[in-house]
Interface confidence: low
């Protein structure tokens, strides 16, 4: 009796049917950017406030006929998806609809930045509490609707977008491709990515995550009682706005960044069929699908952690690939992958102030990525500590020297274009956990970082004989920082992390040989908070139960919630 | 039609002043860019938003504006101040001929331009 | 006026399904949400869930969830619960109650008269 | 799920009492976007089904003698009758409508 999309991101070992929270998302306000709506639809009415505010191109055609239900349609069933009284996520959400999409579904982008700046305006004049706006839009890239939303987001507002229903690049279309937005790819009730006619979901690094988005029952403009199901990466992006609803009313003070983070921890991982995606965008795209947190308890005290790509860099022999992590994130490491194999390594540097991760092409290689870890650690102050090429046939070392600085990731970059194999492997001498090591050719960079209670661990996963992928996870309780491949050598590929584990990806076993050159091991650096544990543990203590605690932890309501940017 | 041959010779009086003495050189240093849709069905052309350097007041987004619409006057183009940004980013939101483009991206204070273009519903 | 007009007594033997149903009359059938609660004799009283005409969704209580299946028919304005493998301690008055759909009215303003169901072997 | 609890399980009075009913939940029952108590009061006379006579904590259902009246909020509530009267001798029930729906477990006002 519950709809499957309702099920699929309550958390599990709940039912959705076993909680009807009367005011999730209570004290969050969700602006809708689409059509016009029916506001006394019988789902939606007396939670949604038609503004005045409609900015829209003609209808196309000469003999097109304005038809109410049909030009009410698209945003009255996204409304419900969002906060709907029986088919809503965040039933308790009150919503503010904007018209920015004709009865053709059809708008522009300055009809779009304008509608952006009247809620900017609106916020200003009427400070409320917490701000999502829902964009079930998409069009080409453009810099200036994405310079919008990062200007919104820096404002405070959480933007939640659709991904797109081309079955190509999200990157390619605003205002997915922003990084300040949340990005959202449709699955269905399979876990596959939708198909929609020969086209579906978008995919790629600039979403963040999927979410239903394949036959989802709402409401339908056609009667105020009346249900319809649609599909697409608008449905998708209802429900993680209504998720982003519900962890907001129960933590109000929760950033951008803190909310994706908690976005990308309480998703579903690896259960999307990655077959799907073309073979070249498959490792790009997050393998996560939207849930609700189980509780509070535990989230708090986490070290929280996502992996961001980069744009590729081009096949042009100095080129570089950039990556680089929100405002308030820490970027703990940073590693490179190249699908030729053909790549100059990886490095962090300062750029405005803050650390990015730029990877290096080699000569004749097809172009890199640069990966970094970005992760959530309150009052840190991360360095990296370099070590040029080594003289000695030893390899090159760096620890991190300073008192109370743990390392959290490992970098290496070399100048020449083939670093030759190293052989035998260099393995850390034990009881040196604070140090990188690497070719004795390569510069060798270390993330060292202090914060409040940090305590940080390698773990190491080699394999004598090629393999082409090598794989190490941190266990529970644990955050994966930092991931990187030893030796290093001209046969590996890249690592990054994905989740909570470290990939280190060699080329085909064909192409090495049995040798020890196929000899591989992949490097873990995991982390963990005793401060922000027991910061979390003297909260829960000192308060009578507030926010997120009232509504999950006494309600019992395992409900919602979602994750964020890959840029 | 009517309405638009009003509104030009009102522009033509009401700025011809205004436009004297006004250096049309951009800021030293800096180009502007033009970007456009890169799908070509999904392009609007003939409307632009212009978007100012970030620390551009409300006041000079306007007298940016009125310059455009000064210097395309003279030239004898008619154009239209169709919405001035402010609060999330300055610049405004105008109608002309794409012939003004050059002349645009040197007018003071403009980072960039961009076409206006499609969005849909997903 | 407004009516919930429930069926007649029902003696049922244990494992065996009983279904109740509840007319509605003198309103908008779908513009209320159907409750069913029950009260054993001399006990008080037990919410099982609940039927949204207008969409079908239904809620049950996690004690009935697997045994309880609500439905409705709009064309005649009748609601229906089905509770299956019945077991002596079913033996109850079984209420329909409505409830106006709207979020800030959940409290059951009529109830039906109640039907009886007997489970004895 | 939230427990309601009734106090006093039974009581007598007689005919122009007052009489005070109270009922306790698990957990707070405001409501924070509506800023109401989801709590509602119901009489209940042998072989009736259930009446309505409070909700929202202290609204009085149409109807329903001013006699009676409601109070409280977050977790404590009582219902008040202010001058018995004959009619009123039954069994009251406070609901929670919080979280799904909950019943207390009744209070049986009988003749003294």
């Known amino acids: 009796s519950i709809p499957w999309n309702l099920e699929r991101i309550t958390p599990p070992r709940y039912r959705a049917d076993e909680y009807q929270p009367p005011d999730g998302g209570s004290l969050v306000e969700v602006y809708l950017l689409d059509t016009s709506i029916q506001s006394d639809h019988r789902e939606i009415e007396g939670r949604v406030m038609v503004t005045d505010f409609e900015n829209v191109p003609e209808e196309d055609g000469t003999r097109f006929h304005r038809q109410a239900s049909k030009c009410d349609s698209h945003g009255t069933h996204l409304a419900g998806v969002v906060s709907g009284r029986d088919a809503g996520v965040a039933k308790g959400a009150s919503m503010r609809s904007l018209r920015v999409l004709n009865c053709q579904g059809k708008g522009t982008v300055s009809g779009t930045l304008i509608g952006l700046e009247f809620i900017r305006k609106s916020q200003l004049v009427q400070p409320v509490g917490p701000l999502v706006v829902l964009l079930p839009l998409a069009g080409g890239y453009s810099r200036v609707l994405n310079a919008a939303c990062q200007r919104l987001a820096r404002a405070g507002v959480v933007l939640v977008t659709a991904a797109g229903n081309f079955r190509d690049d999200a990157c390619l279309y605003s205002p997915a491709s922003a990084p300040e937005v949340i990005t959202v790819g449709a699955t269905n009730a399979q876990d596959q990515p939708v198909t929609l006619g020969t086209l579906g979901t978008n995919f790629g690094r600039c979403v963040d995550l999927f979410a239903p988005g394949e036959d989802i029952i709402g409401a339908s403009s056609d009667c105020s009682t009346c249900f319809v199901s649609q599909s697409g990466t608008s449905q998708a992006a209802a429900h993680v706005a209504g998720i982003a609803a519900m962890m907001l009313s129960a933590e109000p003070e929760l950033t951008l960044a803190e909310l994706r983070q908690r976005l990308i921890h309480f998703s579903a991982k690896d259960v999307i069929n990655e077959a799907w995606f073309p073979e070249d965008q498959r490792v790009l795209t997050p393998n996560l699908v939207a849930a609700l947190p189980p509780s509070t308890h535990g989230a708090g005290w986490q070290l929280f952690c996502r992996t961001v790509w980069s744009a590729h860099s081009g096949p042009t022999r100095m080129a570089t690939a950039v990556a680089r992590c929100a405002p308030d994130e820490e970027l703990l490491s940073c590693s490179s992958f190249s699908r030729s194999g053909k790549r100059r390594g990886e490095r962090m540097e300062a750029q405005g102030g803050k650390l990015v991760c730029r990877a290096h092409n080699a000569f004749g290689g097809e172009g890199v990525y640069a990966i970094a870890r970005c992760c959530l650690l309150p009052q840190a102050n991360c360095s990296v500590h370099t070590a040029p090429p080594a003289e000695a046939s030893m390899g090159t070392r760096v620890h991190c020297h300073q008192q109370g600085h743990v390392l959290t990731g490992c970098s290496s970059h070399w100048e020449v274009e083939d670093l030759g194999t190293h052989k035998p492997p260099v393995l850390r001498p034990r009881g040196q956990p604070n140090q990188c090591v690497g070719h004795r050719e390569a510069s060798i960079h270390a993330s060292c970082c202090h914060a409040p209670g940090l305590e940080c661990k390698v773990k190491e996963h080699g394999i004598p004989a090629p393999q082409e992928q090598v794989t190490v996870a941190c266990e529970e309780g644990w955050t994966l920082t930092g991931c990187s491949a030893l030796p290093g050598t001209s046969h590996v590929l890249g690592a990054y992390a994905v989740d909570n584990t470290c990939v280190v990806r060699s080329r085909d076993v064909s192409t090495t040989g049995s040798t020890s050159e196929g000899a591989v091991t992949a490097v873990a650096i995991c982390c963990r908070s005793r401060h922000l544990a027991q910061a979390s543990q003297e909260l829960q203590g000192s308060t009578s139960g507030s926010g997120l605690n009232d509504i999950f932890e006494a309600q019992k309501i395992e409900w919602h919630e979602h994750h964020h940017h890959h840029h | 039609q009517e309405d638009e041959d009003g509104d030009y010779e009102e522009l033509v009086l009401a700025l011809r002043s205004e436009e004297d003495g006004l250096a049309e050189a951009p800021e030293h240093g800096t180009t502007a860019t033009f970007h456009r849709c890169a799908k070509d069905p999904w392009r609007l052309p003939g409307t632009y938003v212009v978007v100012l350097k970030e620390e551009t007041h409300l006041s000079q987004s306007e007298r940016t504006a009125r310059r455009l619409q000064a210097q395309a006057a003279r030239r004898g183009y008619l154009t239209k101040i169709l919405h001035v940004f402010h609060g999330l980013l300055p610049g405004f939101l105008v109608k002309m001929s794409g012939d003004l483009l050059e002349l645009a991206l040197k007018l003071p204070h403009v980072d960039y331009i961009e076409e206006d273009s499609s969005v849909f519903a997903q | 006026q407004v009516q919930l007009v429930q069926s007649g007594a029902e003696v049922k033997k244990p494992g065996a399904s009983v279904k109740v149903s509840c007319k509605a009359s003198g309103y908008t059938f779908n513009d209320y949400w159907m409750h069913w609660v029950r009260q054993a004799p001399g006990q008080g009283l037990e919410w099982m869930g609940y039927i949204n005409p207008s969409s079908g969704f239904t809620k049950y209580h996690q004690n009935f969830k697997d045994r309880v299946t609500m439905t409705r028919d709009t064309s005649i304005s009748t609601a229906y619960m089905e509770l299956s493998r019945l077991r002596s301690d079913d033996t109850a008055v079984y209420y329909c109650?409505?409830?106006?759909?709207?979020?800030?009215?959940?409290?059951?303003?009529?109830w039906g008269q109640g039907t009886t169901v007997t489970v004895s072997s | 799920d939230i427990q309601m609890s009734q106090s006093p399980s039974s009581l007598s009075a007689s005919v122009g009492d007052r009489v005070t009913i109270t009922c306790k939940s698990s957990?707070?029952?405001?409501?924070?976007?509506?800023?109401?108590?989801?709590l509602a009061w119901y009489q209940q006379k042998p072989g009736k089904a259930p009446k309505l006579l409070i909700y929202?904590?202290?609204t009085r259902e149409s109807g329903v003698p001013d006699r009676f009246s409601g109070s409280g909020s977050g977790t404590d509530f009582t219902l008040t009758i202010s001058s018995l009267q004959p009619e009123d001798f039954a069994t009251y029930y406070c609901?929670?409508?919080?979280?799904?729906?909950?019943f207390g477990q009744g209070t049986k006002l009988e003749i003294k």
């Open positions: 109650a409505r409830q106006y759909d709207y979020d800030e009215d959940w409290y059951f303003d009529v």
């Open positions: 929202w904590a202290s």
């Open positions: 957990q707070s029952l405001l409501n924070s976007r509506t800023r109401k108590n989801f």
């Open positions: 609901k929670q409508s919080f979280n799904l729906f909950t």
